[in-house]
Amino acid sequence: DTEIKVNPPQDFEIVDPGYLGYLYLQWQPPLSLDHFKECTVEYELKYRNIGSETWKTIITKNLHYKDGFDLNKGIEAKIHTLLPWQCTNGSEVQSSWAETTYWISPQGIPETKVQDMDCVYYNWQYLLCSWKPGIGVLLDTNYNLFYWYEGLDHALQCVDYIKADGQNIGCRFPYLEASDYKDFYICVNGSSENKPIRSSYFTFQLQNIVKPLPPVYLTFTRESSCEIKLKWSIPLGPIPARCFDYEIEIREDDTTLVTATVENETYTLKTTNETRQLCFVVRSKVNIYCSDDGIWSEWSDKQCWEGEDLSKKTLLRFWLPFGFILILVIFVTGLLLRKPNTYPKMIPEFFCDT
Amino acid sequence: PGPVPPSTALRELIEELVNITQNQKAPLCNGSMVWSINLTAGMYCAALESLINVSGCSAIEKTQRMLSGFCPHKVSAGQFSSLHVRDTKIEVAQFVKDLLLHLKKLFREGRFN
């Protein structure tokens, strides 16, 4: 009763197609699989960036797998062959591991790479990245940005650099079609006549770095003597209303500061009759239903409602009808007082609950 | 309360998946592996068919039941092929992450059913 053995896959390698971090892991079937012709062999693949605590694991029947990596660090991977129990009339059989690594040979010292890389996807329309030159690099150093995401045939170089003192310190990207909800890879490399420059690699998803425009058309509506509805509109652009969260900052008579986070374009505020002035500002951010993260917009222009305004609107919309009803109540009460008083007292509400 | 937008069921599912990914301390479902799916037509049913193979993992049971809301009756074999390419298994945590990303994309695009 001989023990069933299987070899590890052959020619296991990590291939870099030039997509700035999106790599191919590929291999060939193990030697001497003749005994298992009727059997679907599987492969268990484990891989990670060197330094990462956890391995990513997949099991596949294919001879390749693709994933994204951080090319600032090395990559290690290992694979073995699995013979399912159906093939062996018993327990699953595993081969020994085949291992491989991949890294980009670093040029230059780490200090020469770009510093403080910052990318913002303005209003889900315009991507802008900026950086600072590496520490101690000379003015003859120039940096170049390349980017790739799934859908592009090959990595593209920035065509619209932001410059300072003749050096590239940022990139304005062109319209990026179908580029969100997938990994967006960037490499910033550099050249200098004096010394080699270290490349930097970045990966993010565009929907998570969106900074919307601030909300517009802020308005007030008095709902009752005690309530004011604050309203605003979403800014022009491709972001639908359902993707926004809002933060409101409200000042009453320059003292009370109320901040609230809401999902809709309205907020109802409880007020007192003594309110002389009301001001509010709003800002927006992409919510958790459309992204994992986001950047708050700038605050909107301040919208204020002066006390005189408040009083006039209150007079027109509330106190005039109320006064009319009050006179009517007094009149009816007068009539009722002539008869035996068998009716409950009606007390008008003059004040808001605070 | 006013009309309930059609997006609500998708919002609830997104919230549940966000909850799972944020509360993940140890490997989700002990590192169980599930079939990777094609996130296109028949995606809810395919996701359910894949996740249902994880047993004894209370963390994803609510997700399984919520996916069943979109896909309550079994789809006949000829109706969709999302799951028919069963060639790669991935960890549940990665599956949930990929599914969540796709659901957020659907929500942004207003594709609620």
């Epitope: - | 609500t8 069921a9 609830e12 193979n53 039941r65 919520m66 069943s68 979109f70 079994k74 059913n113």
Partner: antibody, heavy 118, light 111 residues
Framework: EVQLVESGGGLVQPGGSLRLSCAAS????????MSWVRQAPGKGLEWVAS???????YYPDSVKGRFTISRDNAKNSLYLQMNSLRAEDTAVYYC????????????WGQGTLVTVSS | DIQMTQSPSSLSASVGDRVTITCKAS??????????MHWYQQKPGKAPKLLIY???NLESGVPSRFSGSGSGTDFTLTISSLQPEDFATYYC?????????FGGGTKVEIK
Amino acid sequence: EVQLVESGGGLVQPGGSLRLSCAASGFTFISYAMSWVRQAPGKGLEWVASISSGGNTYYPDSVKGRFTISRDNAKNSLYLQMNSLRAEDTAVYYCARLDGYYFGFAYWGQGTLVTVSS
Amino acid sequence: DIQMTQSPSSLSASVGDRVTITCKASESVDNYGKSLMHWYQQKPGKAPKLLIYRASNLESGVPSRFSGSGSGTDFTLTISSLQPEDFATYYCQQSNEDPWTFGGGTKVEIK
């Protein structure tokens, strides 16, 4: 606590119509599929209709074309419009939260009696 | 349509007894290795209650004396030690193929 309360049952003549309602509470109604299951007096259970959270509907041949299941997510309500009623439709009609083909009918209402008789 | 045949149609048992109810489907109700068979309990004048889903999974809140087993076409519901509150009618149901169908029921009575 999940609660399902049926209403709208009663006596109706053959060929007549009736609309059953089910008020749901204690769970996020819109996230779950719902069903109607009936039980003729002294008999077993029979599945009548299902509706997914997205509004897709499913029926057995015995009621297809005569019964219509619908839902109003704003009101947390499920409905069953029954037309061209027959004597064999006489039963207690249960509203149930359907957790799908992998979980079955997870919660049931107390039922409402529909009697089809001349 | 898949026919579900339950046996026995009724049985008498005493408190503490081990009770076994079987359900036979006219064709397999398995889907990718999962049995789409569920068990319900119904007391007189009350709504049914889900006990077991997918042949062997205990629904939340159901006592552990209830268990299910089987695959393909043959399934069993077992009550390891019958309690007074367990006297009821039990139904099996398949969800592998539309229309979903129930068994005729098994009435468990006090001996």
